[in-house]
């Protein structure tokens, strides 16, 4: 014959434990029902009556099956340098994480207690290791033959362009400037002609096209930002 199914509250057999989603009440000395997530124990069980559960009030929660007399208070609202990635509900606490451009300098069990802005690498320096959710950017000087002319928490150093003839040599914070070696076809009045370098820098996501013979004035214009060290080496 199948064993009788006991309904809560019931006295457990000596040496045995209560079933899943039940707890042993020391006062009643009975196995009693736990309350589901989002609820708490309003009235504890007795020898003759089971636990009475009630819903958590606003701004409070319980995440687990429980028999707590009061729900837990949700954490305070997220600060201006944070975003709420999980709202406060009856079943879960609010989670605040750092907004883009910031990292968690002091974490808590879930989310972040204190956010700090990601370090920006100054010209002549690039992002050696990107920032992660929990670690700051590491800046290092540009290696020989590379440069960065931006102040950025994402830009890396990129190679100097290679010129037939160098007008101004590149350095850690400036690209090389190429000069013309021989007269070329005329351009619009006032335009300054600088030929394409022998080998242009690679674009961020595409292979370098073969050098064009078309004239270019781009080297007198402000340099665009270095390709970003997008994404991050997460923990």
């Amino acid at each position: 014959l199948p064993a009788q199914v006991a309904f809560t509250p019931y006295a457990p057999e000596p040496g045995s434990t209560c079933r899943l989603r039940e707890y042993y009440d020391q006062t009643a000395q009975m196995c009693c029902s736990k309350c589901s997530p989002g609820q708490h124990a309003k009235v504890f069980c007795t020898k003759t009556s089971d636990t009475v559960c009630d819903s958590c009030e606003d701004s409070t929660y319980t995440q687990l099956w429980n028999w707590v007399p009061e729900c837990l208070s949700c954490g305070s609202r997220c600060s201006s340098d944070q975003v709420e990635t999980q709202a406060c509900t009856r079943e879960q606490n609010r989670i605040c994480t750092c907004r883009p451009g910031w990292y968690c300098a002091l974490s808590k069990q879930e989310g972040c207690r204190l956010c700090a802005p990601l370090r920006k690498c100054r010209p002549g320096f690039g992002v050696a290791r990107p920032g992660t959710e929990t670690s700051d950017v590491v800046c290092k000087p540009c290696a020989p033959g590379t440069f960065s002319n931006t102040t950025s928490s994402t830009d890396i150093c990129r190679p100097h362009q290679i010129c037939n003839v160098v007008a101004i040599p590149g350095n850690a914070s400036m690209d090389a400037v190429c000069t013309s070696t021989s007269p070329t076809r005329s351009m619009a009045p006032g335009a300054v002609h600088l030929p394409q370098p022998v080998s242009t820098r690679s674009q961020h996501t595409q292979p370098t096209p073969e050098p064009s013979t078309a004239p270019s004035t781009s080297f007198l214009l402000p340099m665009g930002p270095s390709p970003p060290a997008e994404g991050s080496t997460g923990d």
């Epitope: 690039g126 992002v127 050696a128 590491v138 290092k140 290696a143 590379t146 996501t205 060290a229 923990d235």
Partner: antibody, heavy 118, light 107 residues
Framework: EVQLVQSGAEVKKPGATVKISCKVS????????LHWVQQAPGKCLEWMGW????????KYGQKFQSRVTITADTSTDTAYMELSSLRSEDTAVYYC???????????WGQGTLVTVSS | DIVMTQSPATLSVSPGERATLSCKAS??????VDWYQQKPGQSPRVLIY???IRYTGIPARFSGSGSGTEFTLTISILQSEDFAVYFC?????????FGCGTKLEIK
Amino acid sequence: EVQLVQSGAEVKKPGATVKISCKVSGYSITDYLLHWVQQAPGKCLEWMGWIDPEDAKTKYGQKFQSRVTITADTSTDTAYMELSSLRSEDTAVYYCAANSGTGTMDAWGQGTLVTVSS
Amino acid sequence: DIVMTQSPATLSVSPGERATLSCKASQNVGSNVDWYQQKPGQSPRVLIYKASIRYTGIPARFSGSGSGTEFTLTISILQSEDFAVYFCMQSKSYPITFGCGTKLEIK
């Protein structure tokens, strides 16, 4: 140009500890992050960890975390990698590699062969 | 951990021809992929970083492309000195991981 010169080959017994050095010349060691990479025979390259000699901050690969210690001496521009509790599968060439603001491993040492054998 | 899978394991190509090497990441790594060349008895050296930026001093015949999970290293006109092992590496998340390499050999 930065150059990385590593210490010579080592033969160790299982359970022992090895400490390899990596001397940076041409530039200050603080201009780079220094990584250590393992290349075991017939295996893929494995990243072990890095140190920022500027503030001695380290980051280790989980596989090596309990056994590896990376340090740096800025006065001699030298980084060190110590691997403890050696076992036969640690027989490998160990490389140090310098990481500048390019975000890549710009320059590598010549490698140090560590043989673990009883 | 992010797994970097390189194919083919061995590629036989004649000098002067084009070689295309593939690297696939087990999850999105953005453009955080570098390519390294290693010759027998030598240390690796960087060719391409951030998926497509040719490192300073690297010949124009080497180019990199791709983003997300699929990356390609192309050597447009193979020279005799290009026959070596090529590794890809991702630095999107820790641990930094390498592919097991493609051996480029003379056909």
